[in-house]
C-alpha cells in the first residue's frame, strides 16, 4: 500500500505522457488522476513503466473502480492486464470480441496463463455458449485450448462453430472429448458430398461409432493410418477385415506395423486367421480356421 | 535368402502390350505386397503401383492407372505388370520391389534387377 | 501426393572426402525416409531406412539425420566404390515417392 502523500507543486500531470517514466511510485501515486488514467488508458502500452510503476498504476484503477474495471479500461489495460490476478478479472464484465482478443495478444506466445483461463472462463459464459467467432479467436491463440475443456463445458459448443476448428486444435483431445464433438461435427458437416466431408470430418472421428465406420468404409475413402489409430477400439472391433479394407484403401498395407498397437492388436484378435490372411501382409493372431466365435455380448442382450 | 528374379530384356513394337514378370522366392509370397518401379534413360525412379498378392487387389500412382494393369499368380509366385498401348516414352527399365513393414507403409528392401524395356519398330 | 526434392543433382568429390546430399519433402513425412544406392544395370540397394537407421552391412561411412520435412544424407571417407546414384524414398504414404537422384562422381 503506497502512502497518501500530497503531489508537489508543478508536478500534477495533465496527461498519461512518457514524462511519466522520471516519476518516483510516491509521484505516480499522488500526481495521476485515476479518472484520467482510466479515458487515456491506450496511452500507457506505449511508455515503458518499470513493473513497480505499474503496479502503482494498477492500484489506481483499483480504487477507482472497486467492484471492476468497465471495458472501456480492460480493452486498453495491454501489458497492465499481466499484472491483474485472476480476482481481479471475476470481476469484470467482458463482452467484446476485440477487448478478448486485445488482451489474448498481451500474452501471445505464452502458455495459458491462469488470468487467461480466468479471462476467457467470463468471456464464454458471459456469451452464454462458445460460438464460432470465439471459438475462432481463441484456437488461433491457444491450439489447444477446445481439448482443455470438459466434456461437460464442450456440450455447450453448437454445432456451427466447429467449422472454426482446425485438425491440430484437437490432437490433445481424448476420446471422452471426441465423444462430444464427434456427434456436433457429423451435424455441422453433414450437407457436405462425400470426400469433402470426409476431409472436414476425419479429425473428428475419434468419437465414431462402428456404424458410421461402416458407412464410411462404403464411400472410398482412404483413411489414413494416425487417423486409424486414434479411432475408438471398441468401434473398430466390429468391423470386418473386408470393411476395414475398403475404409483404409492403400493405408490398409500400413497394418502390418501396427500390428502390435491398439486398436490394430484387439482388432486382429478378433477376426477369422482366413479373413485376415486375405490382406497379404502376414498378419498373425486371429482366430483359427475352424474355431466357433460366440458373441457374448449378444447373448447377454438378450438374457 | 529373398530373390526377385525378372527377365532382362523384352523388345516390343510401338502400340503393343507387355507383360513383365516378377518371380519371388526365399519368403512368403502372401505376406508381403509388390510394387512396380520405373526408371526411363538418365532420369531418377517412380512408383507405379503395388499389388496385394494375397487377394490381388491392386493400388496405382494415377499417372499410371491407365497405363500399367498389376496382377499376380499365387501359384508361381510371381507378380506381372502389364503395359498397354505402348510409346517411347514406356522405354525404361522397370523394377519390382518387396517392401519391408518396420515402420509406416515399409521401405523397399528387396529389388529385383529390373527388366529394360525397349518399345520400337 | 508428397513431393521429395532432392539436390544437387550431380556432385564430384575426392577419395576420402565428405559429401552430404539433402531431401525436402513437400509436407511432414515423420523421419520415414529411406536412402538408397543404384548403379547400372543392377536393382537400387537399401543403405539407410527410418532417416538414420543403418541397413545390416552397410558401412558406417553412410549415414543419415533429419526430421520434419528436411532430411540430409552423408558419406564420409569417400571410396570408388561409392561412384552411384543415390535416392531417397518416402514412405510415410502408401503412394511412395522418390526424390529425383544424385550422382556423384569421383575427382
Known amino acids: 500500500e503506497v502512502e497518501k502523500t500530497a503531489c508537489p507543486s508543478g508536478k500534477k500531470a495533465p496527461e498519461i505522457d512518457e514524462s511519466l517514466i522520471f516519476y518516483k511510485k510516491w509521484e505516480l501515486e499522488a500526481c495521476v488522476d485515476a479518472a484520467l488514467l482510466a479515458t487515456q488508458m491506450d496511452r500507457v502500452n506505449a511508455i515503458p513503466f518499470t513493473y513497480e510503476q505499474l503496479d502503482v498504476l494498477k492500484h489506481k484503477l483499483d480504487e477507482l473502480y472497486p467492484q471492476g474495471y468497465p471495458e472501456s479500461v480492460i480493452q486498453h489495460l495491454g501489458y497492465l492486464f499481466l499484472k491483474m490476478s485472476p480476482e481481479d478479472i471475476r470481476k469484470w464484465n467482458v463482452t467484446s470480441l476485440e477487448t478478448l482478443k486485445a488482451l489474448l495478444e498481451v500474452n501471445k506466445g505464452h502458455e495459458m496463463s491462469p488470468q487467461v483461463a480466468t479471462l476467457i472462463d467470463r468471456f464464454v459464459k458471459g456469451r452464454g455458449q462458445l460460438d464460432k467467432d470465439t471459438l475462432d479467436t481463441l484456437t488461433a491463440f491457444y491450439p489447444g485450448y477446445l481439448c482443455s475443456l470438459s466434456p461437460e463445458e464442450l456440450s455447450s459448443v453448437p454445432p456451427s462453430s466447429i467449422w472454426a476448428v482446425r485438425p491440430q486444435d484437437l490432437d490433445t483431445c481424448d476420446p471422452r472429448q471426441l465423444d462430444v464433438l464427434y456427434p456436433k461435427a457429423r451435424l455441422a458437416f453433414q450437407n457436405m458430398n462425400g470426400s469433402e466431408y470426409f476431409v472436414k470430418i476425419q479429425s473428428f472421428l475419434g468419437g465414431a461409432p462402428t456404424e458410421d465406420l461402416k458407412a464410411l468404409s462404403q464411400q472410398n475413402v482412404s483413411m489414413d493410418l494416425a487417423t486409424f489409430m486414434k479411432l475408438r477400439t471398441d468401434a473398430v472391433l466390429p468391423l470386418t477385415v473386408a470393411e476395414v479394407q475398403k475404409l483404409l484403401g492403400p493405408h490398409v498395407e500400413g497394418l502390418k506395423a501396427e500390428e502390435r498397437h491398439r486398436p490394430v492388436r484387439d482388432w486382429i484378435l478378433r477376426q477369422r486367421q482366413d479373413d485376415l490372411d486375405t490382406l497379404g501382409l502376414g498378419l498373425q493372431g486371429g482366430i483359427p480356421n475352424g474355431y466357433l466365435v460366440l458373441d457374448l455380448s449378444m447373448q447377454e442382450a438378450l438374457s | 535368402q529373398v530373390q526377385l528374379q525378372q527377365p532382362g530384356t523384352e523388345l516390343v513394337k510401338p502400340g503393343a502390350s507387355v507383360k513383365l514378370s516378377c518371380k519371388a522366392s526365399?519368403?512368403?509370397?502372401?505376406?508381403?505386397?509388390m510394387h512396380w518401379v520405373k526408371q526411363r534413360p538418365g532420369q531418377g525412379l517412380e512408383w507405379i503401383g503395388n499389388?496385394?498378392?494375397?487377394?490381388?487387389?491392386?493400388y496405382y500412382n494415377e499417372r499410371f492407372r491407365s497405363k500399367a494393369t498389376l496382377t499376380v499368380d499365387k501359384s508361381s509366385s510371381t507378380a506381372y505388370m502389364q503395359l498397354s498401348s505402348l510409346t517411347s516414352e514406356d522405354s525404361a527399365v522397370y523394377y519390382c520391389?518387396?517392401?519391408?513393414?518396420?515402420?509406416?507403409?515399409?521401405?523397399?528392401?528387396?529389388w529385383g534387377q529390373g527388366t529394360t524395356l525397349t518399345v520400337s519398330s | 501426393d508428397i513431393q521429395m526434392t532432392q539436390s544437387p543433382s550431380s556432385l564430384s568429390a575426392s577419395l576420402g572426402g565428405k559429401v552430404t546430399i539433402t531431401c525436402k519433402a513437400s509436407?511432414?513425412?515423420?523421419?520415414?525416409i529411406a536412402w538408397y544406392q543404384h548403379k547400372p544395370g543392377k536393382g537400387p540397394r537399401l543403405l539407410i531406412h527410418?532417416?538414420?537407421e543403418l541397413q545390416p552391412g552397410i558401412p558406417s561411412r553412410f549415414s543419415g539425420n533429419g526430421s520434419g520435412r528436411d532430411y540430409s544424407f552423408s558419406i564420409s571417407n569417400l571410396e570408388p566404390e561409392d561412384i552411384a546414384t543415390y535416392y531417397c524414398?518416402?514412405?510415410?504414404?502408401?503412394?511412395?515417392?522418390f526424390g529425383g537422384g544424385t550422382k556423384l562422381e569421383i575427382k
Open positions: 520391389a518387396r517392401p519391408y513393414y518396420g515402420s509406416s507403409y515399409g521401405y523397399f528392401d528387396y
Open positions: 526365399g519368403y512368403t509370397f502372401t505376406n508381403y505386397w
Open positions: 499389388i496385394n498378392p494375397s487377394n490381388g487387389g491392386p
Open positions: 509436407q511432414d513425412i515423420n523421419k520415414y
Open positions: 527410418y532417416t538414420s
Open positions: 524414398l518416402q514412405y510415410a504414404n502408401p503412394l511412395r515417392t
